[in-house]
Interface confidence: medium
Amino acid sequence: EPKFTKCRSPERETFSCHWTDEVHHGTKNLGPIQLFYTRRNTQEWTQEWKECPDYVSAGENSCYFNSSFTSIWIPYCIKLTSNGGTVDEKCFSVDEIVQPDPPIALNWTLLNVSLTGIHADIQVRWEAPRNADIQKGWMVLEYELQYKEVNETKWKMMDPILTTSVPVYSLKVDKEYEVRVRSKQRNSGNYGEFSEVLYVTLPQMSQFTCEEDFY
C-alpha cells in the first residue's frame, strides 16, 4: 500500500509531503491516490478534511503547501486515500519537519602552514541557503562540517556551530580533502542534505620533511 515517505519544510514557510506509489504483486488496483489534510480544531466538530492544494510543484507522488497553506502555530494531519479508504495517515507540526536546503558557496582559505611544511590549517566558509531568512531571525541554523581525505571512506565530523565559517586544523599538505556542510534548525528538526563537496588540495610547501612537526 502507498505510504508517506517524507514531509519536509525547507524554511518554515512552505512544506511538501511525498509518498510511495508502488504496486505490489497480488494487490488489487487501488485507484488514484489523493492526499487530504486538516488542522485539528475541537470547535470544528467534524474534522474538515481538504484535498491537497498542489499535486504538481513538488514532483511526482507529492503534495506542496505554499505559504498561504502553511502555518507554524498548529499541527497538521494528512492522510492518503484511495477508493474512499485511508491507506496512511500522520500528524506533525511544521517545526518538526524542518530540513533546510544545503548550505551554498563553500570556499576555503589557507590560515597557516607548520614550520616543517607537513601540516596546514584552513578556514572554510559558506553561506546559508537562500530561502532561510537568517537576517529576519525566521530561521536559526546550526551547521555541521564533515571532512575526509579523498581516498578515505569515513568522514570526520566537527562539532555543530552557529557561524558560517570554521577553521579546520592539521590537514596533511600532500593530500586532497573533501569537505561538506549541512544544516539544521537549532533545537529542532533534522539535518538537511549536505552541500556540494568542496575539494581542498594543499600543495607540498617545502622540499624537506621532518619526523616531528613544530608550529
Epitope: R39, N41, S71, W73, I74, K136, M139
Partner: antibody, heavy 123, light 108 residues
Framework: EVQLVESGGGLVQPGGSLRLSCAAS????????IHWVRQAPGKGLEWVAY????????SYADSVKGRFTISADTSKNTAYLQMNSLRAEDTAVYYC????????????????WGQGTLVTVSS | DIQMTQSPSSLSASVGDRVTITCRAS??????VAWYQQKPGKAPKLLIY???SLYSGVPSRFSGSRSGTDFTLTISSLQPEDFATYYC??????????FGQGTKVEIK
C-alpha cells in the same frame, strides 16, 4: 501566578534609542513566544515583534524592521525590545504579551499581557 | 498581508441588548482568530481564541463563531461592565500577526 511587567518607557527625541524590558514571573520565557504589541494614543492595537528564546526565532512588523530588535535573557526571565532610530509615529503604549503556545487543537492567542509602558517620541 | 476588517467601528447599545461584532479576513485564516476586550488605560483581555473557544474565566454571554473568512463576536446580554473596545486578531500567518481596527461599544 503569571505576570508580565514592562519598564523602560519614557520621553525620547526623534532618532534616539530606548530599551524596554518585560519581566516575566510564574512561567519560563524560554517555553513561550513573547510578543510586543503597541497602541498609539487613541488608536488600535498593532503587533510589533515576537521572539522564541528557545529556538532563537524572531519576527518583526514591517514598520519597525531594521530599527527594533527583540531579545530575551532566560537567566533573568526577561524579554527586551531595543528601539533605535525612533520616530514620532512610534509614540505608543508598548505591551508585552505571552503567546498561549501551540496546541494540537487550538490556535494560540495572547493569554497574558503586561500593564504597558508609554514611549513618547518628541522634540 | 492578511487584513482583518472589523465592523462596526462603534456602536451604541443598552444593558441587556444582544450585540454582534464582525471581522472579515482578507484571505483564509482557518479558525486562527481571537477576540479581546480593552477598557481605557488597561491592557487587552483575551475573551475568545481559536474562533469560538471561550477563554477560562470569561462569562458565557460571550461567544465566537466562524463562517468561512467571517468571524463574529456575540454578547448575548450586554452588561454594564461590557462597555469597552473589542478587537479581533488573526494568528494564522506565521510571521505577521494582525488586529482589526477595533469596535467601541458605548452606552446608548
Amino acid at each position: 501566578e503569571v505576570q508580565l511587567v514592562e519598564s523602560g518607557g519614557g520621553l525620547v527625541q526623534p532618532g534616539g534609542s530606548l530599551r524596554l524590558s518585560c519581566a516575566a514571573s510564574g512561567f519560563n520565557v524560554s517555553s513561550y513566544y513573547i510578543h510586543w504589541v503597541r497602541q498609539a494614543p487613541g488608536k488600535g492595537l498593532e503587533w510589533v515583534a515576537y521572539i522564541s528564546s528557545y529556538y532563537g526565532y524572531t519576527s518583526y512588523a514591517d514598520s519597525v524592521k531594521g530599527r527594533f530588535t527583540i531579545s530575551a535573557d532566560t537567566s533573568k526571565n526577561t524579554a527586551y525590545l531595543q528601539m533605535n532610530s525612533l520616530r514620532a509615529e512610534d509614540t505608543a503604549v508598548y505591551y508585552c504579551a505571552r503567546w498561549s503556545g501551540t496546541s494540537e487543537y487550538y490556535w494560540p492567542a495572547f493569554d497574558y499581557w503586561g500593564q504597558g509602558t508609554l514611549v513618547t517620541v518628541s522634540s | 498581508d492578511i487584513q482583518m476588517t472589523q465592523s462596526p467601528s462603534s456602536l451604541s447599545a443598552s444593558v441587556g441588548d444582544r450585540v454582534t461584532i464582525t471581522c472579515r479576513a482578507s484571505q483564509s485564516v482557518s479558525s486562527a482568530v481571537a477576540w479581546y476586550q480593552q477598557k481605557p488605560g488597561k491592557a487587552p483581555k483575551l475573551l475568545i481564541y481559536s474562533a469560538s473557544s471561550l477563554y477560562s474565566g470569561v462569562p458565557s454571554r460571550f461567544s465566537g463563531s466562524r463562517s468561512g473568512t467571517d468571524f463574529t463576536l456575540t454578547i448575548s446580554s450586554l452588561q454594564p461592565e461590557d462597555f469597552a473596545t473589542y478587537y479581533c486578531q488573526q494568528s494564522y500567518h506565521s510571521f505577521l500577526i494582525t488586529f482589526g481596527q477595533g469596535t467601541k461599544v458605548e452606552i446608548k
